[in-house]
């Protein structure tokens, strides 16, 4: 326990001290005090360097004194014969005696007292960096204005830390710049910019003067920049030794300025600014960037537009452009989006045609549609070649995205009709000679197929039966054969509006406008035994001249039979209308003068008894196309006649082409009534 004073006496004092003694005393006074040790009596065997007997005074590791011999006071007013003053609060006193004493020695008497020390002046090392203030039992340090006392309570520094700079541009300087900076300070400045900006520091050489490095090259005062795991510096000396532009590649920078106790210089001044993070100019295939720039930085937005034929796809939908932003991490957003070739998909099938399986359905691929030849041809041209276009559609140079249409080839029989075997008034024929021939079983009559959905016949055939049963594709109309042929189901019958409907059709004398159309429920599939006949053109080339030959076919009455089972046909010339007028009506139902003859009728026949007859009605009078000799067109329809085997009258189809086309056009979609 520390004490303020005390007494120390040699063993047996004031009697003689014994031989061979070693005794020590540890003196301790309170902290902040020194020790005044004084001897009032000293009588110890004298020897050189006090080698035999001695009293030793030790402070720490230092011997303050070693005493022996006799002493008396020099001052008559003071009993002190020897004294020690130490500025420490601990002291050790050690007394030693050897094995013999030639005389009787009484030893020593000593006293110690705690004395105040002036820590501010008594030591070589000044305890305070700035102002030292002594008081009894201690001292305290204080600082000049604008300085503060560090936690060690000894050192003063300036309050230069804690500043956080968030502006995109700024200036930072050492304290008091350009006056000398404070000693013994650690200044920390923080720059914290928004993510997406990197701190760039700019220093001028002349704006930097910091105490130079020591002989080992270590900076005594130093400026250091820390950006994440990168450090720039330490820097010191006269004139900035580092790069004048420091690109930190970080949005956060710590600036640390450390000074020691000596050598103050003017310090430093720097400027900083936030540079937006750059994003790389990436090479994105099959696309263009807008705007195009040499350098892209944080917050720049580009529109990436795919080149024609390329798109960005997500799931089942796509887009031709997207936006990408240069982000705070120096990378582009939407970098996963890539322009890939447009996929036109599997081409749509077409009726009566086909498309070969494409090797690829991607942009630029080519496909070819073909029609089922020789029964169908491509009506809307374009050659059938389509390429996968940039908009994802299969496109033809002529039709664009419209699909080709395979329509039946008209007027071309698979086998030409040859009059081989002469039958009375005609020849046996095969359905392949007249693939357009339609058979009506009630009434027994004929018709002509003109396309997939329409049959042309005479009005008088269908006026009594608006739901006729029709057959195509069979030479024979025996029941067993018809069962194997194609039956056509009517959807609607259209009789020419000029055809006069009678209550008693048997007494008819006016066959003007004897023409009708039957719309079929389902399209007819064409082939070698079923294909349509052409309609006449509207030009004068299709005006018939007397003597022009035409073919008629049907299962009507022959000389031998009322009805034919196998198809018959004959080649007849066109005759003047008067020839028909001159023939006496076989079984007149009225006065001969009552029969009406009009320009809507063609007269034909009169050669070798070849003629159409009852049961052939509605069948086509087929004439070779003047503009294409390989084709036949329906110049007429079997209508009526004065007498079988002479001349017959046929509805002049050319006069009805407009009505036929209009009727078909207006009723092209299946009716729902």
């Amino acid at each position: 326990e520390p004490t303020m004073y005390g007494e120390i006496l040699s063993p047996n004092y004031p009697q003689a001290y014994p031989s061979e003694v070693e005794k020590s005393w540890d003196i301790e006074v309170p902290e902040g005090y020194g020790i005044h040790l004084y001897f009032t009596h000293l009588d110890i065997e004298l020897s050189e360097n006090c080698a035999y007997d001695s009293v030793q005074i030790i402070s720490g590791d230092t011997e303050e004194g070693r005493l022996c011999g006799q002493r008396s006071s020099n001052n008559p007013h003071s009993p002190i014969v020897e004294e020690f003053q130490v500025p420490y609060n601990k002291l050790q006193v050690i007394f030693k005696s050897d094995f013999s004493n030639e005389e009787r020695f009484t030893g020593f008497a000593a006293y110690y007292v705690a004395t105040d020390i002036n820590e501010c002046t008594d030591f070589v090392d000044v305890p305070c960096s700035h102002f030292c203030n002594n008081f009894i039992g201690g001292y305290f340090c204080s600082c000049p204005p604008e300085y503060f006392l560090h936690d060690d309570m000894k050192n003063c520094g300036v309050n230069c830390s804690g500043d956080v700079f968030t502006a995109l541009i700024g200036e930072i300087a050492s304290p008091n710049y350009p006056k000398p900076y404070p000693e013994n300070s650690r200044c920390e400045y923080q720059i914290r910019l928004e993510k997406g900006f990197q701190v760039v520091v700019t220093l001028r050489r002349e704006d930097f003067d910091v105490e130079a490095a020591d002989s080992a090259g270590n900076c005594l005062d130093s400026l250091v920049f820390v950006a994440g795991d990168r450090q720039f510096g330490p820097y010191c000396g006269h004139g900035f030794p580092g790069p004048l532009n420091i690109e930190t590649k970080s949005n956060a920078l710590d600036i640390i300025f450390q000074t020691d106790l000596t050598g103050q210089k003017k310090g430093w001044k720097l400027r900083y600014h936030g540079d937006p993070m750059p994003c790389p100019k990436e090479d994105t295939p099959n696309s263009v960037w807008e705007p195009a720039k040499a350098k892209y930085v944080f917050r720049d937005v580009v529109q990436i537009t795919c080149l024609d034929g390329f798109e960005v796809v997500e799931g089942r939908v796509g887009a031709t452009s997207f936006y990408s932003t240069c982000q705070s991490n120096g990378k582009w957003s939407n970098s996963k989006l890539k322009c890939q070739p447009v996929d036109c998909g599997i081409p749509e099938p077409i009726e009566n045609g086909k498309v070969e399986d494409p090797e690829s359905t991607l942009f630029g691929s080519v496909i070819r549609y073909t029609c089922e030849e020789p029964y169908y041809y491509m009506e809307n041209g374009g050659g059938g070649e389509y390429h996968c276009a940039g908009n994802g559609s299969w496109v033809n140079e002529v039709l664009g995205p419209e699909l080709p249409k395979c329509v039946p080839v008209c007027g071309v029989p698979r086998e030409p009709f040859e009059e081989k075997q002469r039958i009375i008034g005609g020849s046996d024929a095969d359905i392949k000679n007249f693939p357009w021939q339609v058979f009506f079983d009630n009434p027994w009559a004929g018709g002509a197929l003109i396309n997939e959905y329409w049959v042309l016949t005479a009005a008088h055939v269908v006026e009594g039966n608006r739901e006729p049963t029709m057959y195509v594709g069979s030479t024979s109309v025996q029941t067993s054969r018809l069962a194997k042929s194609k039956m056509l189901t009517p959807e609607h019958v259209f009789i020419h509006p000029g055809w006069k409907l009678l209550e008693v059709p048997e007494g008819r004398t006016n066959f003007d406008n004897d023409i009708a159309l039957v719309r079929l429920k389902d399209p007819v599939k064409m082939g070698p035994t079923v294909s349509p006949i052409c309609l006449p053109g509207t030009s004068s080339d299709y005006n018939l001249m007397d003597g022009d030959l035409g073919l008629i076919s049907g299962w009507g009455r022959t000389e031998k039979r009322d009805r034919a089972v196998r198809l018959k046909a004959a080649r007849l010339p066109v005759a003047p209308l008067r020839k028909c007028k001159e023939v006496k009506v076989e079984k007149p139902t009225a006065d001969a003068e009552a029969y009406v003859f009009t320009p809507n009728m063609i007269c034909a026949g009169g050669e070798k008894g070849m003629d159409s007859c009852k049961g052939d009605s509605g069948g086509a009078f087929a004439v070779q196309d003047p503009n294409d000799k390989t084709k036949f067109y329906a110049a007429g329809l079997v209508s009526w006649g004065p007498q079988c085997g002479t001349y017959g009258l046929y509805t002049r189809v050319k006069n009805y082409v407009d009505w036929i086309m209009k009727t078909m056009q207006e009723n092209s979609t299946p009716r729902e009534d």
């Epitope: 529109q303 960005v312 997500e314 887009a319 936006y323 932003t325 982000q327 957003s333």
Partner: antibody
Framework: QVQLVQSGAEVKKPGASVKVSCKAS????????MHWVRQAPEQGLEWMGW????????IYAQKFQGRVTITADTSTNTAYMELSSLRSEDTAVYYC?????????WGQGTLVTVSS | DIQMTQSPKSLSASVGDRVTITCRAS??????LDWYQQKPGQSPKLLIY???YRYSGVPSRFSGSGSGTDFTLTISSLQPEDFATYYC?????????FGQGTKLEIK
Amino acid sequence: QVQLVQSGAEVKKPGASVKVSCKASGFNIKEYYMHWVRQAPEQGLEWMGWIDPENADTIYAQKFQGRVTITADTSTNTAYMELSSLRSEDTAVYYCARSRLFFAYWGQGTLVTVSS
Amino acid sequence: DIQMTQSPKSLSASVGDRVTITCRASQDVRTALDWYQQKPGQSPKLLIYSASYRYSGVPSRFSGSGSGTDFTLTISSLQPEDFATYYCQQQYTTPYTFGQGTKLEIK
């Protein structure tokens, strides 16, 4: 088919953290961005951030910067969102969503309740 | 950040009505705008992307238009299943911000 299945509802105390998972099936998350969007009760949608699971790049909305961490485990095809220092106003339904061009598929949502 | 403002906040309409919701961006977002529909207790569903493209499976009565800062979502003839909350969202630049929503209610 494409599905995003999120972890179950959580109740947390203020100051705690929550980690919500989003397991993807029917596609590889490395080919898409995985976003997190939250919706406070009776409030609108609020975008929090996204991750590119291919390279672990993340972008966060400034509001959540420092509090949110979005991660992805490509081996399990799962994305995660961790929100720390929770406060009562973080009570919301948290959705994950997949995108390239747009947010075409969303998780069913995870209700996180923050209450003392 | 880009702010997205929808109007109206709520709207009452009847089945068969034609309805228009508008969305305004605080800065140009070109055509990088999507529309979502959300019903109570459900996740949002994408309706329109890139301002005017209908997402697959979305009925044709939904259409979007606009570019730059002004956008509209139109429902040509309201059906009972269309009563929900609709949100616009810009994907022009991060953060991808949403409008505050428009609640469509039965009159």
